[in-house]
Amino acid sequence: PLATIPVSTTSLTSSEGSTISTPSVDISTPVTTSIVGDQCSRCKNGGFWDGLKCQCLTPYYGESCEEVVNSIDIAPPETVSAQMELTVTVTSVKFTDELKNHSSQEFREFNKTFTEQMNIVYSGIPEYVGVNITNLRLGSVVVEHDVLLRTKYTPEYKTALDNATEVVKQKITKVTTEQIMTNDNCSALMCFNTTGTQVQNITVTQYDPVEECRQKAEEYEDYFLVEYRDQKPYCISPCESGFNASKNCNHGKCQMSQNGARCLCVTTETHWYSGEDCNQGTQKSHHHHHH
């Protein structure tokens, strides 16, 4: 036999005007019942019984996973990054086959000098992390490498990284134009062939809080939205208070349904409340109570 579930009812009036009872478990919806020992659970919306309580899937909560949360945790990365694939031609070092072997002493020495040179070139860029040589080839030394950029996540992170990549382009163009050989001699740390500088590809971290919010909200995706507070994104429904998009239910309770947020209006000893935002109060007829 099914165990009986205590159902508490609250007298609420929907914004359409009819008084309804809202049990903590919606017994009008067919549910699957699982019995574990003496316990009986009705875990809805994909929730499962762990032996003590329903473990609910996002965005649900409640004893039977029947209610929709007002906010969903979304976690942007602490930092976001960009990787620029660049090629420069170094003329102050002559290519030897040993440079192709990344564990050779030649490669290590070249890598050290090249890294020092690029650290000087990009020293004024706060997002600059470092360089990573991916390949060295003949010509004198054609250096295929990645420039790594990183910044703290903010809503404007793409603009920050886009700006940084532009500065990288400007700086590498400048140094490879200025540091050139004179009479087969280089007086700089490294010299370059001006025409050998190319930006092959730029990859920027893709993080979209709106997309994460929509994915986690599942069938409620149209009703959850992202608002920022202190540069941090929050995935909220209109039932979450304290945000620009918050729904004010006045004398009522905000509840999410698959048609969006609605206000369930309360009935007090003295008033009925109605209206879309439960802001229309109707006074009940006076009854004199003798105490």
Partner: nanobody
Framework: EVQLVESGGGVVQPGGSLRLSCAAS????????WGWFRQAPGKEREAVAL???????FYADSVKGRFTISQDNSKNTLYLQMNSLRAEDTAMYYC?????????????????WGQGTQVTVSS
């Protein structure tokens, strides 16, 4: 790792000669680049004479025709023959090396250094 030890420095009169030697340990002497740099008190280190395994050589304008760089691969030794020495040649002379075939006069591009030998030209 390449280790470099200089010798041959000393005090000499203007117009005199000295021969500096730089003994290298390791098996890299036949490849890469070798050179002599000098640093006078209060001045930056500067390239004096450089040589690479592909035949490239460099001499500072102030020493051209007076100094000669050479190497003996069998002895793993680099030399600097200095003739017609002048007072302005007074400095600490350093031997430098790199396994890379370099074309740069910038000391920061050279990875291995000796401790230096003092050359003083004075009457």
């Amino acid at each position: 790792e390449v280790q470099l030890v200089e010798s041959g420095g000393g005090v000499v009169q203007p117009g005199g000669s000295l021969r500096l030697s730089c003994a290298a340990s390791g098996d890299t002497f036949s490849r890469g680049s070798w050179g002599w740099f000098r640093q006078a008190p209060g001045k930056e280190r500067e390239a004096v004479a450089l040589i690479s395994s592909d035949g490239w050589t460099f001499y500072a304008d102030s020493v051209k025709g007076r100094f000669t760089i050479s190497q003996d691969n069998s002895k793993n030794t680099l030399y600097l023959q200095m003739n017609s020495l002048r007072a302005e040649d007074t400095a600490m002379y350093y031997c430098a090396a790199s396994v890379l075939v370099l074309r740069t006069l910038n000391p920061k591009a050279w990875h291995h250094w000796g401790q230096g030998t003092q050359v003083t030209v004075s009457s």
